[in-house]
């Protein structure tokens, strides 16, 4: 009597998420009598897949018809495959008793789940930087099979190589996630820019998933300040103006200072943006210059983004007045801790 | 090349729990089943238990009242818990990887850590 | 539970001779599958056990071929064809039919 055989051909198949697997299993012989089980995995802990006498198995139908005389083939179909169906399955013959005893085992197909990667998401530093600062930036993306990924940053469309990336876990798996951080050194510049984290991946088809951060949400461009003397009027009041330039966000407190003392208060809001994204504000202070007796010192102090707060400062002659309509006199910075702790002195 | 590492608390006081830790590295979690085994100083060695990947776990009834364990494949990592120590728990304890393609049974332990060892004293 | 039993408890042997270990368990380990669930662990000293027969007659992987499994239902045999000097250690024999896996109580190889 020839020794019974159960055939599994494939030692491995394939099958995208969403998409039904069909693992073939054939016997040798017709007897001994008794069923066919399938089970994914083997040993005690091993799950029941389908059992053509007894059970309900809605994913799972058999390729031919079981109970037609002769029938040698015991394949079957699992409908909408997903990552957790991978694994290995066996398909195993039973000889007829109470209860059924396994005679013999199929050698197993791997099932491997073929899932796309979700859509990248990428996170930026929780606080803003300067320019020439490097600032990093993250990317994840998950649940794809198998574990073959390339992952790619761009900003503006130039490729960015000072990255690092991990794909976990490290052996096989169900599913896999990549997460890859990027380091970007940033320019005044950049307040329009963008970095793409592109991920491509065998389920793709070629057409890569990106995910987008704008640097904007990184990057802090401090002001230059510069303080000037618009021109003396007739009636003995100087306008002063404080030009606050090239800054982003927009989020300035502009504070202006008579002699040390605190004459008003303004918040930057509305403004037109700079083609660079920056932004540009002037305010003016009208010093009666007749009121006072001794020399004015104006100081415009601004405060960028919560940052500590810079000063410039302007000192109205009051001892000799020009009558003439006199042309613009720039300020000087006084004060050895007034200077635009930014480079931003205009 | 498939690497298991135990880590835990190496004295545990008595009616304590003892919590150990196995990082599988290498490999997958994935189609094996995962056990411990513990060796009493210059004793034999016991099986404790273990966890397939579909989280099905098999106790040894001896120790079934007060062992838990427990799988992260997430993190490649599975866990063992065993309430209300005693002396009698000293031991060096083993993780270990269990194969299993052939029908019922398993098919050998073929990878294990290289053992952690646990002191029950107060 | 199924009870297994080594024996001899210890085994003196020369190097280059030859050397055989005996296992038996409390019901037989040949399942209707035709296998034997029956193991063969070596734990050299201040080591973890390492596997090197399974499912009775199997050599696993990187074992020498001196080292051999014989054996079905309830006797099994453990053979060394040529002992060599890295071969001392306790040698276990294990059950993997049925939980609880159960190991014999062990057999210590030593040279005379």
């Known amino acids: 009597e020839e020794e019974l055989q159960v055939i599994q051909p494939e030692k491995s198949v394939s099958v995208a998420a969403g998409d039904s697997a069909t693992l073939n299993c054939t016997v040798s012989s017709l007897i001994p009598v008794g069923p066919i089980q399938w089970f994914r995995g083997a040993g005690p802990g091993r799950e029941l897949i389908y059992n053509l006498k007894e059970g309900h198995f809605p994913r799972v139908t058999p390729v031919s018809d079981p109970t037609k005389r002769n029938n040698m083939d015991f394949s079957i179909r699992i409908s909408n495959i997903t990552p957790a169906d991978a694994g290995t399955y066996y398909c195993v013959k039973f000889r007829k008793g109470s209860p059924d005893v396994e005679l013999k085992s199929g050698a197993g197909t791997e099932l491997s789940v073929r899932a796309k990667p979700s859509a990248p998401v990428v996170s930026g530093p929780a606080v803003r930087a300067t320019a020439e600062h490097t600032v990093s930036f993250t990317c994840e993306s998950h649940g794809f099979s198998p574990r073959d990924i390339t992952l790619k940053w761009f900003k503006n469309g130039n490729e960015l190589s000072d990255f690092q990336t991990n794909v976990d876990p490290a052996g096989k798996s169900v599913s896999y996630s990549i997460r890859s951080t990027a380091r970007v050194v940033l320019t005044r510049r950049d307040v329009h820019s963008q970095v793409i984290c592109e991920v491509a991946h065998v389920t793709l088809q070629g057409d890569p998933l990106r995910g987008t951060a704008n640097l904007s949400e990184a990057i802090r461009v401090p002001p230059f300040l510069e303080v000037t003397q618009q021109s003396m009027r007739a009636d003995n009041q100087v306008n002063v103006t404080c030009q606050v330039t090239k800054f982003y966000p927009q989020r300035l407190q502009l504070t202006w200072l008579e002699n040390g003392n605190v004459s008003r208060t303004e918040m930057a809001s509305a403004l037109p943006e700079n083609k660079d994204g920056t932004y540009n504000w002037t305010s003016w202070l009208l010093v009666n210059v007749s009121a006072h007796r001794d020399d004015v010192k104006l100081t415009c102090q601004v405060e960028h983004d919560g940052q500590p707060a810079v000063n410039k400062s302007f000192s109205v002659k009051v001892s000799a007045h020009p009558k003439e309509q006199g042309s613009n006199t720039a300020a000087e910075n006084t004060g050895t801790n007034e200077r635009n702790i930014y480079g931003g002195s205009g | 090349q498939v690497q298991l590492q135990e880590s835990g608390p190496g004295l545990v006081r008595p009616s304590e729990t003892l919590s150990l830790t196995c990082t599988v590295s290498?490999?997958?979690?994935?189609?094996?089943?995962w056990s411990w085994i513990r060796q009493p100083p210059g004793k034999g060695l016991e099986w404790m238990g273990f966890?397939?990947?579909?989280?099905?776990?098999f106790y040894n009834p001896s120790l079934k009242s007060r062992v838990t364990i427990s799988l992260d494949m997430s993190m490649n990592q599975f866990s063992l818990k065993m309430t209300s120590v005693t002396a009698a728990d000293t031991a060096v304890y083993y993780c270990?990887?269990?194969?299993?393609?052939?029908?019922?049974?398993?098919?050998?332990?073929?990878?294990w850590g290289q053992g952690t060892t646990v002191t029950v004293s107060s | 539970d199924i009870v297994m039993t080594q024996s001899p408890l210890s085994l003196p042997v020369t190097p280059g001779e030859p050397a055989s270990i005996s296992c038996k368990s409390s019901q037989s380990l040949l399942y209707s599958n035709a296998y034997n669930y029956l193991d063969w662990y070596l734990q050299r000293p201040g080591q973890s056990p390492q596997l090197l027969i399974y499912?009775?007659?199997n050599r696993a992987s990187g074992v020498p071929d001196r080292f051999s499994g014989s054996g079905s239902g309830t006797d099994f045999t453990l053979k060394i064809s040529r002992v060599e000097a890295e071969d001392v250690g306790v040698y276990y024999c294990?059950?993997?039919?049925?939980?609880?896996?159960?190991f014999g109580g062990g057999t210590k190889v030593e040279i005379k």
């Open positions: 294990m059950q993997a039919l049925q939980t609880p896996l159960t």
């Open positions: 270990a990887r269990v194969r299993a393609y052939s029908g019922i049974g398993l098919d050998g332990t073929d990878v």
């Open positions: 290498g490999g997958s979690i994935r189609n094996y089943y």
């Open positions: 966890i397939y990947d579909n989280g099905r776990t």
């Open positions: 499912l009775g007659s």
